[in-house]
Interface confidence: low
């Protein structure tokens, strides 16, 4: 999986009038990294991990860059003629990647009201657009606007490609290692519930990447979906993720239940603690 930096900018119009605010979210290697909103942009690192990657001297630079990009996108939205009444959004997603063989990829995508209408490969400068007439109209609109400023057309997108890769390399050199795989810590806890039932909860934390399977099994067989309750897979602020799954079981039958976890090709099972032992911790390697 390549290292990646992804910028997601959104600007809005209301009844044809472009709003002064914008929202930018930056993801580094798929992790929420920076967030910048409204016209008083604050490049807010998303957790301690992001703080560590950025270092304390880069905030002003990130804020300035993101604010400039937001203004550019607002100008682009103002030139879209298809402004109907109500709330509309223009979204620009810019992605650059560095692969393990050191090859690079960069692309840029425009969405209007959530619908993709224009893409560009920032290395080859090749534009693509969906076949729908609405998308084609929007795409021509935006491309014409971008071409109005010849200098911008010639330099802006090359700069976006170069800057994105430069920023990505800078982040990767920050000294905070973005590890490919971090195994989860799995905790199983129990809490007393009513009428002879207990609730058992299996928590996985500190893992990367985010893809994980966590479920309860009875006698080795997965419980049905509707008897389990899942938490979302959420960033924990350290560049890793956390999640949980819970179910209700009859007291005395704890030994029949196990939590099954699968992550990055490794899997393990974790029993329910019995008696007065409330937490069982196991960290597989």
């Amino acid at each position: 999986e390549p290292h990646s930096l992804r910028y997601n900018l959104t600007v809005l119009s209301w009844d044809g009038s472009v709003q002064s605010g914008f929202l930018t979210e930056v993801h580094l290697d798929g992790q929420p990294f920076l967030r910048c909103d409204r016209q008083k942009c604050r490049a807010k690192p998303q957790g301690q991990w992001a703080e560590d990657v950025l270092g304390n001297k880069t905030w002003d630079r990130e804020t300035r860059d993101l604010t400039g990009n937001g203004k550019d996108l607002r100008m682009t939205l103002a030139h879209i003629k298809d402004q109907k009444e109500g709330l509309h959004s223009l979204q620009e997603i810019r992605v650059c990647e560095i692969h393990e063989d050191n090859s690079t990829r960069s692309s840029q995508h425009f969405y209007y009201d959530g619908e993709l209408f224009l893409s560009q490969n920032l290395e080859t400068k090749e534009w693509t657009m969906p076949q729908s007439s609405r998308a084609q109209t929007l795409a021509m609109n935006v491309r014409n606007f971008l071409k109005e400023d010849a200098m911008k057309t010639k330099t802006h997108y090359h700069a976006m490609h170069a800057d994105c890769l430069q920023e990505l390399r800078r982040y990767l050199k920050s000294g905070v290692v973005l590890r490919r795989t971090v195994p989860p810590m799995v905790n199983v806890t129990r809490s007393e519930a009513s009428e002879g039932n207990i609730t058992v909860t299996c928590r996985a934390s500190g893992f990367y990447p985010w893809n994980i399977t966590l479920s309860w099994r009875q006698d080795g067989v997965s419980l049905s979906h509707d008897t389990q309750q899942w938490g979302d897979v959420l960033p924990d602020g350290n560049g890793t993720y956390q999640t949980w799954v819970a179910t209700r079981i009859c007291q005395g039958e704890e030994q029949r239940f196990t939590c099954y976890m699968e992550h990055s090709g490794n899997h393990s099972t974790h029993p329910v603690p019995s008696g007065k032992v409330l937490v069982l911790q196991s960290h597989w390697q």
Epitope: G21, K40, S89
Partner: antibody
Framework: QVQLVESGGDVVQPGRSLRLSCAAS????????IHWVRQAPGKGLEWVAV????????YYADSVKGRFIISRDNSKNTLYLQMNSLRAEDTAVYYC??????????WGQGTMVTVSS | AIQLTQSPSSLSASVGDRVTITCRAS??????LAWYQQKPGKVPKSLIY???SLESGVPSRFSGSGSGTDFTLTISSLQPEDFATYYC?????????FGQGTRLEIK
């Protein structure tokens, strides 16, 4: 036009569960963080929970953490609030709200939840 | 959680008066503050976002100022439709919090 419409409010007994829905129309629902805000009778506004536009991040007020679950179905333009282990102090009008990004300029009309034995 | 304290809790004023409501945050929130107006039985209405930016369609007699921990909502010349309850709200960090409200009544 831009609209949020809540439903699912009811009178329930303490300890029971209830699920609220919020249907969105007139804007690109999947682009927006959506929040639940509540207001107890005669009281002020209290923020309850938020779910990010893509459903990845969720945050809750301490008063509902562990009992309420916020979720969304972007394919249906609908927001949900699953309320478990309800208490008398959860009695309120529940609003869904949104805006670009966190100051709410889009509000639903509210749905009343009464928790009483 | 960041606490917001509004003052006064209630105030009486007359049409044409200049009115100021303050909101103090328990810690710095930059300019991440919004103001809302709510009339009895109605949905809250956004007036100001980012401490000083006027929402679209809101009359220019409403203005907001402040940064960090101290914020102000000012109504330059009260109109009959302005009598309502006003709330401040911080969106600097989760959990989002509201002030307790300021009730503005006719004198």
């Amino acid at each position: 036009q831009v609209q949020l419409v809540e439903s699912g409010g009811d009178v329930v007994q303490p300890g029971r569960s209830l699920r609220l829905s919020c249907a969105a129309s007139g804007f690109t629902f999947s682009n927006y963080n959506i929040h639940w805000v509540r207001q107890a009778p005669g009281k002020g506004l209290e923020w309850v929970a938020v779910i990010r536009y893509d459903g990845i991040n969720k945050y809750y007020a301490d008063s509902v953490k562990g009992r309420f679950i916020i979720s969304r179905d972007n394919s249906k333009n609908t927001l949900y609030l699953q309320m478990n282990s309800l208490r008398a102090e959860d009695t309120a009008v529940y609003y869904c709200a949104s805006g670009p990004p966190d100051a709410f300029n889009i509000w639903g009309q509210g749905t009343m939840v009464t928790v009483s034995s | 959680a960041i606490q917001l304290t509004q003052s006064p809790s209630s105030l009486s004023a007359s049409v044409g008066d200049r009115v100021t409501i303050t909101c103090r945050a328990s810690q710095g929130i930059s300019s991440a503050l919004a103001w809302y107006q709510q009339k009895p039985g109605k949905v809250p209405k956004s007036l100001i976002y980012d401490a000083s930016s006027l929402e679209s369609g809101v009359p220019s007699r409403f203005s907001g100022s402040g940064s960090g921990t101290d914020f102000t909502l000012t109504i330059s010349s009260l109109q009959p439709e302005d009598f309502a309850t006003y709330y401040c709200q911080q969106f600097n960090s989760y959990p989002i919090t509201f002030g307790q409200g300021t009730r503005l009544e006719i004198k």
